[in-house]
């Protein structure tokens, strides 16, 4: 956030940039949390825009019995590996075809034991506050589907009649990693010393990191004709004085008519 300065007072302003602001020759360049001519004001809203998507990775092991292991399968650039990868990927795409979050598979290692396939199943979902539940559900469906296919597609009389056959007991889920996104934590961190006063509110399933000085939210502080300003002790209303009234009170809701004061009378609205 920047505020441009013109005229003789500018040099004087330069040395007065506050809160880590830096002078660029024209204006104070303020750090993210501040704005104003001297970077003296605390912003009321911090952008913690979530990622568009959240990913999960499941580390799985399956044993393919319809292919005999050869040393060439260890070499990821060999024709054998490339062909195995193509067939395995096509097979897994069929297995997981009903899972909207499914992105694909990535083979990490092939080893002896018929062919033991260490691989990652990649999942992705659009960010919503319920993303954890969505991905948890998807990982459960992955487990169900891979268990089912490795139980059904098995060798009969030493021949596989499916695209691939599996060893029923060779299926294992090693690990599940979900990209962590915690808007509350991000909000607290980015608000730094004002972290106690910033909260996350959702609008159209998007998180907003706001202080009570940001209007239009359930936590918003109503300062009436005054101005909400954040300080280290929390949000405060700075009350205005008009030609006819002084305003006071925690929310600037108490107006005193100047003429009555001069006339030694107090009148509250």
């Amino acid at each position: 956030r920047t505020t441009t300065c013109f005229g003789d007072g500018c040099q004087n302003t330069a040395s007065r940039c506050k809160n880590g602001g830096t002078w660029d020759g024209l204006k104070c360049q303020c750090p993210n949390l501040y704005y104003g001519e001297l970077c003296e004001e605390v912003v009321s809203s911090i952008d913690i825009g979530p990622p568009e998507t959240i990913s999960a990775q499941m580390e799985l092991t399956v044993t393919v019995t319809s292919v005999k292991f050869t040393e060439e399968l260890k070499n990821h650039s060999s024709q054998e590996f490339q062909e195995f990868k193509q067939t395995f990927t096509e097979q897994m795409n069929i297995v997981y075809s009903g899972i909207p979050e499914y992105v694909g598979v990535n083979i990490t290692k092939l080893r002896l034991g018929s062919v033991v396939v260490e691989h990652d199943v990649l999942l992705r979902t659009k960010y919503t506050p319920e993303y954890k539940t969505v991905l948890d559900n998807a990982t459960e469906v992955v487990k169900e589907k891979i268990t089912k296919v490795t139980t059904q597609q098995i060798m009969i009389n030493d021949i596989c009649s499916d695209m691939m056959c599996f060893n029923t007991t060779g299926t294992q889920v090693q690990n599940i990693t979900v990209t962590q996104y915690d808007p509350e934590e991000d909000c607290r961190k980015m608000a730094k010393e004002y972290g106690d006063y910033f909260v996350v509110e959702y609008r159209d399933q998007k998180p907003y990191c706001i202080s009570p000085c940001e209007p239009g939210f359930s936590v918003s502080k109503n300062c009436n004709l005054g101005k909400c300003q954040m300080s280290l002790s929390g949000p405060q209303c700075l009350c205005v004085t008009t030609e006819t009234h002084w305003y006071s009170g925690e929310t600037c809701n108490q107006g005193t008519q100047k003429s009555l004061v001069y006339g030694h009378h107090h009148h509250h609205h």
């Epitope: 054998e80 195995f84 067939t87 009649s161 695209m163």
Partner: nanobody, 123 residues
Framework: EVQLVESGGGLVQPGGSLRLSCAAS????????MSWFRQAPGKEREGVAI???????GYADSVKGRFTISQDNAKNSLYLQMNSLRAEDTAVYYC?????????????????WGQGTMVTVSS
């Protein structure tokens, strides 16, 4: 790139014999697997026989004891000896190859294909 060319198809009477050949370019013979598939009119392609570089052979139940798969690595050729032919053996016969040592008679497991040769069993 692997290229497969089948030959030997034709018209044969029930109970007769026929020998199909498949000439292959590339070195799949010494490394992977070769197989024969067939597709009858209006039906799905089905596995007939398979042979792997480790010497293993496998057959579909419908042809066991009647058909024999073999290969000649020196000539880069695959063969299918078909005896006691029946009307239901009528189909286009395809040669397929893989760099993998396969134990699968599902066409989706195979990556390289010939154009096919027609076998008609009829009196």
């Amino acid at each position: 790139e692997v290229q497969l060319v089948e030959s030997g198809g034709g018209l044969v009477q029930p109970g007769g014999s026929l020998r199909l050949s498949c000439a292959a370019s590339g070195n799949t013979f010494s490394r992977g697997s070769m197989s024969w598939f067939r597709q009858a009119p209006g039906k799905e392609r089905e596995g007939v026989a398979i042979i792997s570089s480790d010497g293993w052979t496998g057959y579909a139940d419908s042809v066991k004891g009647r058909f024999t798969i073999s290969q000649d690595n020196a000539k880069n050729s695959l063969y299918l000896q078909m005896n006691s032919l029946r009307a239901e053996d009528t189909a286009v016969y395809y040669c397929a190859a893989s760099f993998l040592v396969l134990r699968a008679l599902n066409p989706k497991a195979w990556h390289y294909w010939g154009q096919g040769t027609m076998v008609t069993v009829s009196s």
